[in-house]
């Protein structure tokens, strides 16, 4: 996260931390005791889940090895399109005033609204500080219009972008596949932005997972 | 700002190992976010691209070479190497350490453009 | 592996002309195309990124266009500096990395 501060403790409990052994690999959400969300671009063979801990390395929180992960259908490694993926944990997750599950949106959020994105990536680029606390930015709903012109074709139908006016304030790497919450709800996964992060009026882009919420739970049904 | 530098023998011998490192300055390869990579160039043909390694140690190969290649990083030294096994006359080339600048972060770091060159040295395969 | 194809491989142009290279890719790759630019005995320089991205201290008669499978680099008015072999690079996430055949570009 670039230009942001240290997340209110306990402000996230429906955030996890996606390792590669003991290496941040992306951000994600518990949907339930037995799923995650995450960006499909996070994909790997096996997944160990950082759960109710603002503190990577905290012994005190939970981890779960995950092996079974399922990208959406129509992810495109070339566009992004579709950039979402459920992944499975191999036991459930023990629910608790830090480990809650995260409210799914029932509608879209509009142009304007402030959000939170938070995640254990980066805090500078191009060279790299990685925080052992989750941090946090408040950043805004921009309309797919704006967002057009700074991206051109690169944006799609189901891409959602945040940012502030003349400000650094962005996800960087590390972030991925972590929340964007807008009014208390899911309204983003951190999908991709421009290099170096931080670039003023450069928008970050996010997965708009409003328009997912069927995918998510008939996928979850499916593979119960 | 930053520099690439290569070194290694400028002759090796058919069947013996290539071996040539590449010196970064003016900036660190352990902590910065980019990839660094090695491309040859054939006398008078084009470019082909070795392999990469990520900053965090992950490296990525051509699969035409994979068989015979290894890129390493030493942070102590702020050096990248490449070894390159059974060399034969067709491994004859200007050999080139570049940096690789990452297109974008997320989904769009894994594509990058190679921004800074060094200036390349001459390996002959030849007994 | 994605094949990258340069036309022309060589072309003679004046000082002032306006000088177009094509590169096709085999498939899809969306934006995500390097332009490159050599001269005789010298490392390649970064021109153009992600398609259509001038890279910091090139002059802007460089541009590029493109995204999907068929990419343009265009030299609004060529400067003697100019005169040198371009090459168009294909960013992985999946290697290898590849480049065209590059494109000679020679005083008439």
């Known amino acids: 996260i670039i230009d942001g501060a240290p997340c209110a403790r306990g402000s996230h409990p429906w955030q996890v931390a996606l390792l590669s052994g003991n290496q941040l690999h992306c951000g994600g959400v518990l949907v339930n005791e037995r799923w995650v969300l995450t960006a499909a671009h996070c994909k790997m063979n096996e997944y160990t889940v950082h759960l109710g801990s603002d503190t990577l390395g905290d012994r005190r929180a939970q981890r779960i090895k995950a092996s079974k992960s399922f990208r959406h259908p129509g992810y495109s490694t070339q566009t992004h399109v579709n950039d979402l993926m459920l992944v499975k944990l191999n036991s459930q997750a023990r629910l608790s005033s830090m480990v809650k599950k995260v409210r799914l949106p029932s509608r879209c959020e509009p142009p304007g609204t402030t959000c939170t994105v938070s995640g254990w990536g980066t805090t500078t680029s191009p060279d790299v500080t990685f925080p052992s606390d989750l941090m946090c930015v408040d950043v805004k709903l921009i309309s797919p219009q704006d967002c057009t012109k700074v991206y051109k074709d690169l944006l799609e139908n189901s891409m959602l972008c945040a940012g502030i006016p003349d400000s650094k304030k962005n996800a960087c790497n590390g972030d991925s596949g972590g929340p964007l919450v807008c009014r208390g709800t899911l309204q983003g996964l951190v999908s991709w932005g421009t290099f170096p992060c931080g670039q003023p009026n450069d928008p970050g882009v996010y997965t708009q997972v409003c328009k997912f919420t069927k995918w998510i739970n008939d996928t979850m049904k499916k593979h119960r | 700002q930053l520099q690439l530098q290569e070194s290694g023998p400028g002759l090796v011998k058919p069947s013996e190992t290539l071996s040539l490192t590449c010196t970064v300055s003016g900036g660190s390869i352990s902590s910065s976010d980019y990839y660094w990579g090695w491309i040859r160039q054939p006398p008078g043909k084009g470019l082909e691209w070795i392999g990469s390694i990520y900053y965090s140690g992950s490296t990525y190969y051509n699969p035409s070479l994979k068989s015979r290649v290894t890129i390493s990083v030493d942070t102590s030294k702020n050096q990248f190497s490449l070894k390159l096994s059974s060399v034969t006359a067709a491994d004859t080339a200007v050999y080139y350490c570049?940096?690789?600048?990452?297109?974008?972060?997320?989904?769009?770091?894994?594509?990058?453009?190679?921004?800074?060159w060094g200036q390349g040295t001459t390996v002959t395969v030849s007994s | 592996d994605i094949q990258m194809t340069q036309s022309p491989s060589s072309l003679s142009a004046s000082v002032g002309d306006r000088v177009t290279i094509t590169c096709r890719a085999s498939?899809?790759?969306?934006?995500?195309l390097n332009w490159y630019q050599q001269k005789p005995g010298k490392a390649p320089k970064l021109l153009i990124y992600?398609?259509?991205s001038l890279q910091s201290g090139v002059p802007s008669r460089f541009s590029g266009s493109g995204s999907g499978t068929d990419f343009t680099l265009t030299i609004s008015s060529l400067q003697p500096e100019d005169f040198a072999t371009y090459y168009c690079?294909?960013?992985?996430?999946?290697?290898?990395?590849?480049f065209g055949g590059g494109t000679k570009v020679e005083i008439k």
């Open positions: 570049a940096r690789g600048r990452p297109l974008g972060y997320g989904a769009r770091h894994y594509y990058y453009g190679m921004d800074v």
């Open positions: 992600s398609a259509s």
């Open positions: 690079q294909q960013s992985p996430p999946f290697p290898p990395l590849t």
């Open positions: 498939q899809s790759i969306s934006s995500y």
